[in-house]
């Protein structure tokens, strides 16, 4: 927000050529400097195995200040979460690059049934104090059925959501051990107020 | 930025009902018209084979004014590069659609080792005068191990970065001959100041 | 837009210390409150089979007000279309998650020719009154050649385009029966004025 002793005062006129309207006609519009908006781009770090609870995908933790990573304008990162400092519409995005090895899913199908493939999943989750359970905002999920090889591939997600001050965002993955944490440009998470 | 002889002058008041504060109390806030921000969307063209250095992915060149492509507000395109005219936070994105043929990677694994799969990679790279090495901002990389078929698939990337005036952006790919250059909606590159 | 009797009046000065310039020098800059810009995020619903013309991909219809979905600031959704209420540069995005079953594309290639693989395609299309043909803005297309399994995977698209008031946007897919309509976070479509 434009911060000074008072507020941004933008005057309105009925006619462009008219003199300034008297001050009691001033309209206080919520204009703000774009550079002042909450923004963050977080990059991957090596994940320390943490306990996660049954039926819940583990959350990734992130680098928030080194290299390409940053948080600014009251957007803070702590303990796996991006903390939303101001209500509004945010564009939220993440890419997770996975890598692993599969060799069993091309086997002959037993009993005429196709094998259930392995899969990789990324979820961007919102935790809010105004709702009793986490809300899945975005999900990218993909079957992985490569034939006898080391495989690697990214899942990218991004969309706009209305968030409230105090909301928390995290990125959950189906299997933390498959996440490629080697390069900051391969796996990342960000959000910015529109 | 709002460009005129001087700068956008937005006055602040301690009290909403007060007369305009004297001019020495004016605060010059970086408000700007959104339509005035540097923006570009570039679309694919047929690539002319160019020499590139060993261990360095070749850069794509782009259409910048025909069809869906445009550059505006001092964001210029020249010689494979988007030129950043103003420091700030930019959202940068690209999609590259690849197509090719593979048939060898499902063969029996020799010596018990899985084959190293073929792969496709897109990198969005920043070149800064003040830094000797290009910086990889975004990478999408995917193993390709299709079974005896013509394959095609996109890699999409997008994220926010703090850029400096004079920075240059390019898109590099692992193999220029696999890029689908047939349609402007399949392979593209863009950036806009937030 | 900042809406009052007149327009936002932002004065310019050649020198910061100078008195206010006379009113005939005022420049009316298109400053606007960010929260007032047209925006929409639409989420998947179960698709009712509708007739579509040969050689034309069917359009998805969407949820526009329940759950995560919303339209605001004169951006309206009607009959598969997002309606653009104001000219400007928009970021447009969509993800479609597909799921299906394939088992035939790894068969021995007949006559030395690789099989034409199955494929999945998403297109974001613009319809303009002043132009007879729809314009394909974005396309994500992918061969699907999984070996004897149930498969699922997303295609994500997003980019910036200059749109005109009255333009209409839709999302077309190659096969509506393969779209995963089960969760609002898997398949979605959105746009916002920059």
């Amino acid at each position: 927000q434009l911060r000074a002793q008072g507020e941004a005062c933008v005057q309105f006129q009925a006619l462009k050529g008219q003199e300034f309207a008297p001050s009691h006609q001033q309209v206080y519009a919520p204009l703000r400097a774009d550079g002042d908006k909450p923004r963050a781009h977080l990059t991957v770090v090596r994940q320390t195995p943490t306990q996660h609870f049954k039926n819940q995908f583990p959350a990734l933790h992130w680098e928030h200040e080194l290299g390409l990573a940053f948080t600014k304008n009251r957007m803070n990162y702590t303990n796996k979460f991006l903390l939303i400092p101001e209500s509004g519409d945010y564009f939220i995005y993440s890419q997770v690059t996975f890598r692993g090895m599969t060799s069993e899913c091309s086997e002959i199908r037993q009993a005429g049934r196709p094998n259930k493939p392995d899969s990789i999943t990324v979820v961007i989750t919102k935790v809010t104090d105004s709702y009793p359970e986490p809300t899945q905002l975005l999900m990218g999920t993909k079957s992985v059925c490569e034939v006898g090889s080391n495989w690697f591939q990214p899942i990218y997600l991004g969309a706009m959501f209305s968030l409230q001050e105090g909301d928390k965002l995290m990125v959950n993955v189906s299997d933390i051990s498959l996440v490629d944490y080697t390069k900051e440009d391969k796996t990342f998470f960000g959000a910015f107020l529109l | 930025q709002l460009r005129a002889q001087g700068e956008a002058c937005v006055q602040f008041q301690a009290l909403k009902g007060q007369e305009f504060a004297p001019s020495h109390q004016q605060v010059y806030a970086p408000l700007r018209a959104d339509g005035d921000k540097p923006r570009a969307h570039l679309t694919v063209v047929r690539q002319t084979p160019t020499q590139h250095f060993k261990n360095q992915f070749p850069a794509l060149h782009w259409e910048h004014e025909l069809g869906l492509a445009f550059t505006k507000n001092r964001m210029n395109y020249t010689n494979k590069f988007l030129l950043i005219p103003e420091s700030g936070d930019y959202f940068i994105y690209s999609q590259v659609t690849f197509r090719g043929m593979t048939s060898e990677c499902s063969e029996i694994r020799q010596a018990g080792r899985p084959n190293k799969p073929d792969s496709i990679t897109v990198v969005i790279t920043k070149v800064t005068d003040s830094y000797p090495e290009p910086t990889q901002l975004l990478m999408g990389t995917k193993s390709v191990c299709e079974v005896g078929s013509n394959w095609f698939q996109p890699i999409y990337l997008g994220a926010m970065f703090s850029l400096q005036e004079g920075d240059k952006l390019m898109v590099n790919v692992s193999d220029i001959s696999l890029v689908d250059y047939t349609k402007e909606d399949k392979t593209f590159f863009g950036a806009f100041l937030l | 837009q900042l809406r009052a009797q007149g327009e936002a009046c932002v004065q310019f000065q050649a020198l910061k210390g100078q008195e206010f310039a006379p009113s005939h020098q005022q420049v009316y800059a298109p400053l606007r409150a960010d929260g007032d810009k047209p925006r929409a995020h639409l989420t998947v619903v179960r698709q009712t089979p509708t007739q579509h013309f040969k050689n034309q991909f069917p359009a998805l219809h969407w949820e526009h007000e329940l759950g995560l979905a919303f339209t605001k600031n004169r951006m309206n959704y009607t009959n598969k279309f997002l309606l653009i209420p104001e000219s400007g540069d928009y970021f447009i995005y969509s993800q479609v998650t597909f799921r299906g079953m394939t088992s035939e594309c790894s068969e021995i290639r007949q006559a030395g020719r690789p099989n034409k693989p199955d494929s999945i395609t998403v297109v974001i299309t613009k319809v303009t009154d002043s132009y007879p043909e729809p314009t394909q803005l974005l396309m994500g297309t992918k061969s699907v050649c999984e070996v004897g399994s149930n498969w699922f995977q997303p295609i994500y698209l997003g980019a910036m385009f200059s749109l005109q008031e009255g333009d209409k946007l839709m999302v077309n897919v190659s096969d509506i029966s393969l779209v995963d309509y089960t969760k609002e976070d898997k398949t979605f479509f959105g746009a916002f004025l920059l």
Partner: antibody, heavy 116, light 106 residues
Framework: QVQLVQSGAEVKKPGASVKVSCKAS????????MHWVKQAPGQGLEWMGR????????KYDPKFQVRATMTTDTSTSTAYLELSSLRSEDTAVYYC?????????WGQGTTVTVSS | EIVLTQSPGTLSASPGERVTMSCRAS?????MYWYQQKPGQAPRLLIY???NLASGVPDRFSGSGSGTDFTLTISRVEPEDFAVYYC?????????FGGGTKLEIK
């Protein structure tokens, strides 16, 4: 399993302070928000406020803002409610609960009695 | 703050009966939540986000409504349902509870 266990009953004199604890198990408190609710004898429920353990960010009902302080210790998965300058009208059962994760969980309640 | 008014204050019913209780908000809210409290126990969430049944809650409980008017319905009252029921809104700060409806045996 997922549960919240609160500290035992307290008897305090007017003007004193009390600190009630609420220990979480079966979940990471940083993944949720911890709320405090007051119930005076024979009365209904009153929401006092909540804390986000991940950030320490708090929101209070204005009527509790001055004398209630919510904190957490993430290393022990414990939330605390401290009430200062106690008065007789603070006599009540105080419950902790969580939001942001189902199932909904409440502590068993801590009775605070303020009496001279 | 948003004031929630529950009615009736007390509701008498016999086992097997259908009962409904109301919660009216002083201004529009996004969602309503319903809790059950028995003497000497902590409240228990029954319904979240207006109409979603919380885990382990029998399906004889249901919630409905929007805007300012919300309803909790018990299709066939069981003996263990006699308790106090509170609505709560989470839309405005501060959170607020209604004054409660006591369901008693007729």
């Amino acid at each position: 399993q997922v549960q919240l266990v609160q500290s035992g009953a307290e008897v305090k004199k007017p003007g004193a302070s009390v600190k009630v604890s609420c220990k979480a198990s079966g979940f990471d408190i940083c993944d949720t928000y911890m709320h405090w609710v007051k119930q005076a004898p024979g009365q209904g429920l009153e929401w006092m406020g909540r804390i986000d353990p991940a950030s320490g960010h708090t929101k209070y009902d204005p009527k509790f803002q001055v004398r209630a302080t919510m904190t957490t210790d993430t290393s022990t998965s414990t939330a605390y409610l401290e009430l200062s300058s106690l008065r007789s009208e603070d006599t009540a059962v105080y419950y902790c609960s969580r939001s942001g994760g189902l199932p909904d969980v409440w502590g068993q309640g801590t009775t605070v009695t303020v009496s001279s | 703050e948003i004031v929630l008014t529950q009615s009736p204050g007390t509701l008498s019913a016999s086992p097997g009966e259908r009962v409904t209780m109301s919660c009216r908000a002083s201004s529009s809210v996004s969602y309503m939540y319903w809790y059950q409290q028995k003497p000497g126990q902590a409240p228990r969430l029954l319904i979240y986000a207006t109409s979603n049944l919380a885990s382990g809650v029998p399906d004889r409980f249901s919630g409905s409504g929007s805007g300012t008017d919300f309803t909790l319905t018990i299709s066939r009252v069981e003996p263990e349902d006699f308790a106090v029921y509170y609505c709560q809104q989470w839309s405005g700060n501060p959170r607020t509870f209604g004054g409660g409806t006591k369901l008693e045996i007729k």
